[in-house]
Interface confidence: low
């Protein structure tokens, strides 16, 4: 009863020309030990012969004969539990289905594993949190659906083309559940990082470039403001006029409201980027700043100290 065969392995394995593929695999045949194992490439069932046709990459029969010339293909398993395979190096034309033809005393089974070999190293994939806010620590993740014992790789993080100083943690998985290499970087972005390009670069053991993925940082932040005053020294006499201008150097998302504050108190009906004070009086001396808000929160400019002297 072929329903007794239970296999566990990654569904699809990914590699590129010249690299290798390590296929973690376990199986169970309840009626006893394996007597014959054949690894096919793209097997097809032949109804006339009741056998499978296809390239035989590896063959192991009960009398121990291993006629395979494919030294690059290794069966690292055993007769009752392990069906792990290694192909090193792996070639473009290895893409397709690997068929594990297993036979025990009374049962037969064909297990299929998909192999996807690309011509060049495929890029990793950067995963960002759904939202990034300034000064809040986030974890950047770079994931590559590849890991192989015979082909060491590394993932490096770059910001605007320059290696990032923060320490990244790299982990690999070579299990029946999943095969991947992952790099995680904890990072506290500043507002000035908004719009900057982050790269995760795949390199070989010698640091040679293989591929990369890039993302543009979208750092949510309160409006960043500059205040300008005329006259520039903010010292005037009673009766003079003063103009203060608020400039938004950056805001993400877009700003929604503008207000002016004097000594921390909002000035009524002053909701434009220019504050005009005409014929100032002594009691208008004080600390002025502009406040611009967006969905993240309010941003304030530096304070300007206005000194109104007697005429």
């Amino acid at each position: 009863d072929s329903s007794k065969w239970v296999f566990e392995h990654p569904e699809t394995l990914y590699a590129w020309e010249g690299a290798c593929v390590w296929i973690p695999c376990t199986y169970r045949a309840l009626d006893g030990d394996l007597e014959s194992f054949i690894l096919f490439h793209n097997p097809e069932y032949n109804k006339n012969t009741s056998k499978f046709d296809g390239t035989r990459l590896y063959e192991s029969t009960k009398d121990g004969k291993v006629p395979s010339e494919q030294k690059r293909v290794q069966f690292l398993g055993d007769k009752n539990k392990n069906c792990t395979l290694s192909i090193h190096p792996v070639h473009l034309n290895d893409s397709g289905q690997l068929g594990l033809r297993m036979e025990s005393k009374t049962e037969k089974w064909m297990e299929r594993i998909h192999l996807n070999v690309s011509e060049r190293p495929f890029p990793p994939h950067i995963q960002l949190p759904p939202e990034i806010q300034e000064s809040q620590e986030v974890t950047l993740t770079c994931l590559l659906n590849f890991s192989c014992y015979g082909y060491p790789i590394q993932l490096q993080w770059l910001l605007e083309g320059v290696p990032m100083r923060q320490a990244a943690v790299t982990s690999t998985s070579l299990t029946i559940k999943s095969v991947f290499t992952r790099s995680e970087l904890k990072f506290s972005p500043q507002w000035s990082h908004h719009g900057k390009i982050v790269t995760c670069q795949l390199q070989d053991a010698d640091g040679k470039f293989l591929s990369n993925d890039t993302v543009q940082l979208n750092v949510k932040h309160t409006p960043k403001l500059e205040i300008k005053v005329t006259p520039s020294d903010a010292i005037v006499r009673e009766g003079d006029s003063v103009t203060m201008t608020c400039e938004v150097s950056s805001s993400n998302p877009e700003y929604t409201t503008v207000s002016w504050l004097k000594d921390g108190t909002s000035l009524k009906k002053q909701n434009t980027f220019t504050l005009n004070l005409r014929e100032v009086t002594k009691d208008q001396s004080g600390k002025y700043c502009c406040q611009v808000s967006n969905d993240v929160g309010p941003g304030r400019s530096e304070e300007v100290f206005l000194q109104v002297q007697y005429a």
């Epitope: 990654p10 569904e11 699809t12 097997p43 069932y45 499978f52 289905q97 064909m110 998909h114």
Partner: antibody, heavy 120, light 112 residues
Framework: EVQLVESGGGLVQPGGSLRLSCAAS????????MNWVRQAPGKGLEWVGR????????NYSGKFKGRFTISADTSKNTAYLQMNSLRAEDTAVYYC?????????????WGQGTLVTVSS | DIQMTQSPSSLSASVGDRVTITCRSS???????????LEWYQQKPGKAPKLLIY???NRFSGVPSRFSGSGSGTDFTLTISSLQPEDFATYYC?????????FGQGTKVEIK
């Protein structure tokens, strides 16, 4: 264009047998799992079983094992559902559905369905 | 067998409404490969079902972007962001991770 066309439905007496056919065209028949799904009148969908035509490998839902048999003929690009010892509760529309990818498992193409009525 | 329970069984909604259908499995439907083979199908009266979403959240080709899927483990959701006249139908979740494969009982989306 990928197409599945079922046939063989009709009226059958309780205890009788019926063989449904699902003719496939527009793709490599032997390399995709073919599923049978049924739907009793006014009820939901129920998975019956599947076959991989390339090697004849099958899986069934437990309640259909023994009475229903799925087979395939790659020379005719046709899958079959042989139903024996039919009961009134087997009255349903029977659909064949292709697994679009042996690696993603989803039913991307369905036949139009064929109605089986079990009644005396 | 894994039971797939959908809620609600039926709902009435208007064109433009946001509709959410949930599907709960009686046990985890994570496949040994690490994938979760959870699909959503749409069926109209007298017609064969049509695939909308596969592997929890992947939209099948040609399916409008107003359909989205989410979830993990045992809890899954199909969302229609803005219901259109052609969306009134019955929706089924389906697990293809463990044998026997099983469908939910269906959710009928009717015009209010």
């Amino acid at each position: 264009e990928v197409q599945l066309v079922e046939s063989g439905g009709g009226l059958v007496q309780p205890g009788g047998s019926l063989r449904l056919s699902c003719a496939a065209s527009g793709y490599e028949f032997s390399r995709s799992w073919m599923n049978w799904v049924r739907q009793a009148p006014g009820k939901g969908l129920e998975w019956v079983g599947r076959i991989y035509p390339g090697d004849g490998d099958t899986n069934y839902s437990g309640k259909f094992k023994g009475r229903f048999t799925i087979s395939a003929d790659t020379s005719k690009n046709t899958a079959y559902l042989q139903m024996n010892s039919l009961r009134a509760e087997d009255t349903a529309v029977y659909y064949c559905a292709r697994d679009g990818s042996s690696w993603d498992w989803y039913f991307d193409v369905w036949g139009q369905g064929t109605l089986v009525t079990v009644s005396s | 067998d894994i039971q797939m329970t959908q809620s609600p069984s039926s709902l009435s909604a208007s064109v433009g409404d946001r509709v959410t259908i949930t599907c709960r499995s009686s046990q985890s439907i994570v496949h040994s490969s690490g994938n979760t083979f959870l699909e959503w199908y749409q069926q109209k009266p007298g017609k064969a079902p049509k695939l909308l979403i596969y592997k929890v959240s992947n939209r099948f080709s040609g399916v409008p972007s107003r359909f989205s899927g989410s979830g993990s483990g045992t809890d899954f959701t199909l969302t229609i962001s803005s219901l259109q006249p052609e969306d009134f139908a019955t929706y089924y979740c389906f697990q293809g991770s463990q044998f026997p494969y099983t469908f939910g009982q269906g959710t009928k989306v009717e015009i209010k």
